[in-house]
């Protein structure tokens, strides 16, 4: 059928809660393409009806919620004018009681559900929440060994739990909980995270971590003004340059004449062992030429992009 097959690594998922997977494969999905989801090589596409428990939402496949029988191989087919790619995703659903203390870690969990804190340092855990724009996420609550986390050493910052002066007692089973609302219905997302500790210096203390963006797309109307923050954590003594680039050129240089897209002034918040930096990019007026173009946030050797995309047509307006 002329499609190139791409195999993603297996995803281990928790039953009875929402799950979404975005069919993005830059640069394939950056141009004008159509994306269609299928299950187990079925010829019938996944439904696009939003009332369906499993449905396609733009480039995403959305499970509201995930159930036992949903395990299997899902394919998303990306068709461009001159190309076709079929991405295979193996989803395995398991039942996990996050408060079952008899289980010491889950070796088969996806990497984002296994995180490491550095002893004696200020560090953070991330609640990975990957859902389409149609899903509205409430505030995140954090738990350790089934008890809600409190205390001045812990700070919730967006999707992260900041932990100051990490100790050996901070290892163990964590969970982040959020209420997801979709089409007026509410669902609970509870992500378990097994947290181990180390005294090692991690990245050698010099590689910055880009918290946002995450190589993601943003829906934005033509002609609107848009401001996007790039959030970076880095060591206090770092000398890394932080900037936005497009086509491998600083945005301020690329749009030197029109000044339509500009990089903002960098700000930072200081924590005990690291700094959290924010540098934004402002689109005074989004133009057609901006869509599908990766706008890269750079921090030292780290980089991540956002891509603007037109919102799906709202047929309810007709």
């Amino acid at each position: 059928d002329g499609c190139n097959d791409i195999f993603m690594k297996n995803e281990m998922l928790s039953a009875s809660q929402p799950f979404a997977f975005n069919c993005t494969f830059p640069p394939i999905t950056s141009g004008e393409v159509s994306v269609t989801w299928y299950k187990n090589s079925s010829k019938i596409p996944v439904s696009k009806i939003i009332q369906s428990r499993i449905h396609q939402d733009e480039t995403w496949i959305l499970f509201l919620p995930m159930e036992w029988g949903d395990s299997g191989v899902y394919q998303c087919v990306i068709k461009g004018r001159d190309s076709c790619h079929r991405i295979h995703v193996n989803l395995t659903v398991f039942e996990k009681q996050w408060c079952d203390t008899s289980v010491k870690g889950l070796p088969n969990l996806s990497d984002e559900y296994k995180q490491i804190l550095h002893l004696g340092k200020d560090d953070s855990l991330t609640c990975h929440l990957h859902f389409p724009k149609s899903c509205i996420l409430g505030p995140i609550k954090w738990y350790k060994d089934c008890n809600e986390i409190t205390g001045e050493r812990f700070t919730v910052l967006e999707t992260r739990l900041l932990v100051s002066n990490v100790s050996a007692e901070d290892r163990g089973n964590y969970a982040c909980q959020v209420i997801l609302t979709h089409s007026g219905k509410q669902y609970e997302v509870l992500n378990g995270i097994t947290v181990s500790i180390t005294e090692r210096a991690g990245y050698g203390g010099s590689v910055p971590k880009i918290i946002y963006p995450k190589n993601n797309s943003i829906e934005v109307q033509l002609g609107t003004t848009l401001i996007v923050d790039c959030n970076i954590t880095d060591t206090k003594d770092n000398t890394n340059l932080r900037c936005w680039r497009v086509n491998n050129t600083l945005v301020d240089d690329y749009y030197n004449e029109s000044k339509r897209i500009r990089e903002g002034v960098e700000t930072h918040a200081s924590f005990r062992e690291y700094n959290l930096y924010t540098v934004n990019i402002t689109f005074l007026e989004v133009k057609m030429e901006d869509y599908g173009l990766p706008f890269m946030c750079h921090a030292g050797v780290s980089a991540a992009y956002i891509m603007l995309q037109l919102p799906a047509p709202d047929f309810r307006a007709y």
Epitope: D111, L119, A168, R171, S196, I197, R200, A201
Partner: antibody, heavy 120, light 106 residues
Framework: QVQLQESGPGLVKPSQTLSLTCTVS??????GYWNWIRNHPGKGLEYI?????????YYNPSLKSRVTISRDTSKNQYYLKLSSVTAADTAVYYC??????????????WGQGTLVTVSS | DIQMTQSPSSLSASVGDRVTITCRAS?????MYWYQQKPGKAPKLWIY???NLASGVPSRFSGSGSGTSYTLTISSLQPEDFATYYC?????????FGQGTKLEIK
């Protein structure tokens, strides 16, 4: 159950490069820290270095100019290369990983070790 | 580099004896790790985070210490305890081992 297995030639000529493979089963090398340690005959343990979940590598400064640790996540294997070997590099080489009781530095899982002799 | 010095380097003792092995670091370390190794075998994690016994390690073993001085103690030596014991630190790279203490039957 996490298992590690070293493989590679048991005999290497002086000035050549020692190459070993550690094949991991029961865990993904994209989580945790994956270490190389050696034990000289009749002597103690020496820490060589590690490759982390992110691909970051750390080398013991005493070996840094000669050592390279790399990985192939698709095969779930990681590798040790030690260049310009001499008789002093004759040792039993172990691959090992931690994570026991959520402590990455507690090296609980070890390979059985492979003896590498440097001799012409 | 942090130097780890174990004492004694070797020790002859009898079954039933109380044995203490000391590991001294040249600078402060946060935690100590201990490994047991028998001839021709890979080392085994014995004690982690200074005082926690690894799975399968008998309760006659204990670990203690802080700063620069750490000890591994066997309250009543058994035949299967004769082996070489190594301490290790991760506080400062390079992650050094002690030179080992060989525990032999008297």
């Amino acid at each position: 159950q996490v298992q590690l297995q070293e493989s590679g030639p048991g005999l290497v000529k002086p000035s050549q490069t020692l190459s070993l493979t550690c094949t991991v089963s029961g865990a993904s090398i994209t989580s945790g820290y994956w270490n190389w340690i050696r034990n000289h005959p009749g002597k103690g343990l020496e820490y060589i270095g590690y490759i982390s979940y992110s691909g970051y590598t750390y080398y013991n400064p005493s070996l840094k100019s000669r050592v390279t640790i790399s990985r192939d996540t698709s095969k779930n294997q990681y590798y040790l290369k030690l260049s310009s070997v001499t008789a002093a590099d004759t040792a039993v080489y172990y691959c090992a990983t931690g994570g026991y009781d959520y402590v990455e530095d507690a090296l609980y899982y070890w390979g059985q070790g492979t003896l590498v002799t440097v001799s012409s | 580099d942090i130097q780890m010095t174990q004492s004694p380097s070797s020790l002859s003792a009898s079954v039933g004896d109380r044995v203490t092995i000391t590991c001294r670091a040249s600078s402060n370390v946060r935690y100590m790790y201990w490994y047991q190794q028998k001839p021709g075998k890979a080392p085994k994690l014995w004690i982690y985070l200074t005082s926690n016994l690894a799975s399968g390690v008998p309760s006659r073993f204990s670990g203690s210490g802080s700063g620069t001085s750490y000890t591994l103690t066997i309250s009543s030596l058994q035949p299967e305890d004769f082996a070489t014991y190594y301490c290790q630190q991760y506080t400062t790279s390079p992650y050094t081992f002690g030179q080992g203490t060989k525990l032999e039957i008297k």
